[in-house]
């Protein structure tokens, strides 16, 4: 056969979906390769055909879209599972194609199956929420395009293994729920459960996502740095080790960059002749506010390197701060016959 | 469980048009700092139910309040005292209704506002 | 603002009947109504909530249904003391606001 554009396993988007419920997948070649839509491949002559490659198999095979009930079947550019089952899982092929144009994108479908209290290896989406902020809503997620606009599926919710009826603050409005007020207690896995009919048979959708509780902008504030300070001096004698910890607090803040770094004499470590080394450890609250330390160490310090200015920096979508610390040679201890001594005139 | 109802005297609260007055709600047999929301709930002379607002009692203290309530009337409580208050300010003769504090539990259903207070009649008057 | 309307009022049916009292909320409101008796000099007093579920203590001749924007109160085995106005309250959220909205009330006789 004449080449084909070949745009290989994309295995970004891994679709899990399921067992015994619906599922409708899109051809990727539409929404990540190619320039135009369906309805323009369409027009222009092209015809969209799909296989699979069975899961631990090698070979390409057509999909059976003669199975009762129509159980697969091709809409458009979607392939439809009314349900799918757990041999369904497997690489899918979609290929664009009319004789003088030819362009296929292959994808991973894994058939997942959940116990009684939705627990699975599906990979959740996380949504977070801000603490003791008003009125903050989830959404059932991808749910659209299984059932008209005419059809009211029936919506139920759950919070782990159990159905929400009011609790926690939580009220289930259809396809939202909505929290009237965000509190740790809310963390944990929301579970919606979509029941619509659908040519006589009734169908499922269940989608899980994790809520994760994090601090409110309303009480954000630019990064706080705990030390160095000015109670503490690191004092130290040539050769001893300088250990100077930078401890910055970062309030929770949506899609922040937080940083953290020294300067000595002004400059970046990198960019000096010292023999330094910078160890960082990050630690998070329970609302995702973030402690950061960096310990700058030199492990013999000489006296030039204990007359240099150590200046810790943070920086957050908050704003910017710095510190520096307090170094000092260590005057060392009078030895007495000599020093002590002298100073009493003795000769 | 119940709701006692204090503010305005037991004749109930007399007050001149732009006056101010603090009606308080205490919960009496549970704790308001559990997990409770306060609500209030005001009925002018025989009219119907008109809900003011709802404040979280714990130590939160989260607020709702109805549109219209326009910034003039104010919820606040008090944790040590198992109180939720509601301040009036800038009254008029409109505002003349009982006012009624009742209890939600969210862990139940935020429909449910259960128990009710006797309730405390305001009047604006000159 | 969410809106709720009672119809009719007033309503009367003889002891041992049956009344119903229908609520239309303005806008969806899913299962979040509860239903309110109030008789004079008193507090409201719940009766239903999430639409269907009875308060506690409540008589089984209380029930509720509905969802989305139409609800109804049923009072069947009517009593005497039965004789109340009758309020819905529909619970919504919007961004950043709550609203509670009580229906215009339903009075009942009883005849």
């Known amino acids: 056969s004449e080449r084909c554009d070949d745009w290989g396993l994309d295995t970004m988007r891994q679709i899990q979906v399921f067992e015994d419920e619906p599922a409708r997948i899109k051809c990727p070649l539409f929404e990540h390769f190619l320039k135009f839509n369906y309805s323009t491949a369409h027009s222009a002559g092209l015809t969209l055909i799909w296989y699979w490659t069975r899961q631990d198999r090698d070979l390409e095979e057509p999909i059976n879209f003669r199975l009762p009930e129509n159980r697969i079947s091709k809409e458009k550019d979607v392939l439809w599972f009314r349900p799918t089952l757990l041999n369904d899982t497997g690489n899918y092929t979609c290929m664009l194609r009319n004789t003088t144009y030819c362009s296929k994108v292959a994808f991973p479908l894994e058939v997942v199956q959940k116990d009684s209290c939705f627990n699975s290896p599906m990979k959740l989406p996380v949504h977070k929420l801000y603490i003791e902020y008003g009125i903050q809503r989830i959404t059932c997620p991808n749910v659209d395009g299984y059932f008209p606009s005419s059809v009211k599926p029936t919506i139920t919710w759950y919070m782990g293994c159990y159905k929400i009826q009011n609790f926690n603050n939580v009220i289930p409005e259809g396809m939202n729920l909505s929290f009237l007020i965000a509190l740790i207690s809310n963390n944990g896995n929301y579970t919606c459960v979509v029941t619509y009919p659908e040519n006589g048979r009734t169908f499922h959708l269940t989608r899980t996502l994790t809520v994760k509780v994090v601090g409110s902008p309303k009480n954000a504030v630019p990064p706080v740095i705990h030390s160095p300070n000015d109670h503490v001096v690191y004092e130290k004698e040539p050769g001893e080790e300088l250990l100077i910890p930078c401890t910055v607090y970062f309030s929770f803040l949506m899609d922040s960059r937080n940083e953290v770094w020294w300067t000595i004499d002004g400059k970046k470590p990198d960019d000096i002749t010292i023999d330094v080394t910078i160890n960082e450890s990050i630690s998070h609250s329970r609302t995702e506010d973030e402690t950061r330390t960096q310990i700058l160490s030199i492990k013999k310090v000489t006296s030039e390197d204990l007359k240099r200015s150590y200046v810790c920096h943070a920086r957050s979508a908050k704003g910017e701060v710095a510190k520096a610390a307090k170094v000092k040679q260590k005057v060392p201890a009078p030895r007495y016959t000599v020093e002590l001594a002298c100073g009493f005139g003795a000769t | 469980q119940q709701l006692e109802q204090s503010g305005g005297g037991a004749e109930g609260g007399l007050v001149k048009p732009g006056g101010s007055l603090e009606l308080c709600c205490k919960a009496?047999?549970?704790?308001?700092?559990?997990?409770?929301?306060i609500c209030w709930v005001r009925q002018a002379p025989g009219k119907g139910l008109e809900w003011i607002g709802c404040i979280y009692a714990n130590s939160v203290g989260s607020t709702y309040y109805a549109s219209w309530v326009n910034g003039r009337f104010t919820l606040s409580r008090d944790i040590d005292q198992s109180t939720g208050c509601l301040q009036l300010n800038s009254l008029t003769a409109a505002d003349t209704a009982m006012y009624y504090c009742a209890r939600v539990d969210p862990g139940y259903s935020f429909d449910a506002f259960d128990p009710w207070g006797p309730g405390t009649l305001v009047t604006v008057s000159s | 603002a969410l809106v709720m309307t009672q119809t009719p009022s007033p309503v009367s049916a003889a002891v041992g009947g049956t009344v119903t009292i229908n609520c239309q909320a303005s806008?969806?409101?899913?299962?979040?109504l509860a239903w309110f008796q109030q008789k004079p000099g008193q507090p409201p007093k719940l009766l239903i909530y999430?639409?269907?579920t009875l308060a506690s203590g409540v008589p089984s001749r209380f029930s509720g249904s509905g969802s989305g924007t139409e609800f109804t109160l049923t009072i069947s085995a009517l009593q005497s003391d039965d004789a109340a106005t009758y309020y819905c309250l529909g619970v919504r959220t919007y961004f950043n606001t709550l609203n509670n909205s009580f229906g215009g009330g339903t009075e009942v006789v009883v005849k």
């Open positions: 009496s047999g549970f704790s308001l700092t559990t997990n409770y929301w």
């Open positions: 806008e969806d409101i899913y299962s979040n």
């Open positions: 999430r639409a269907s």
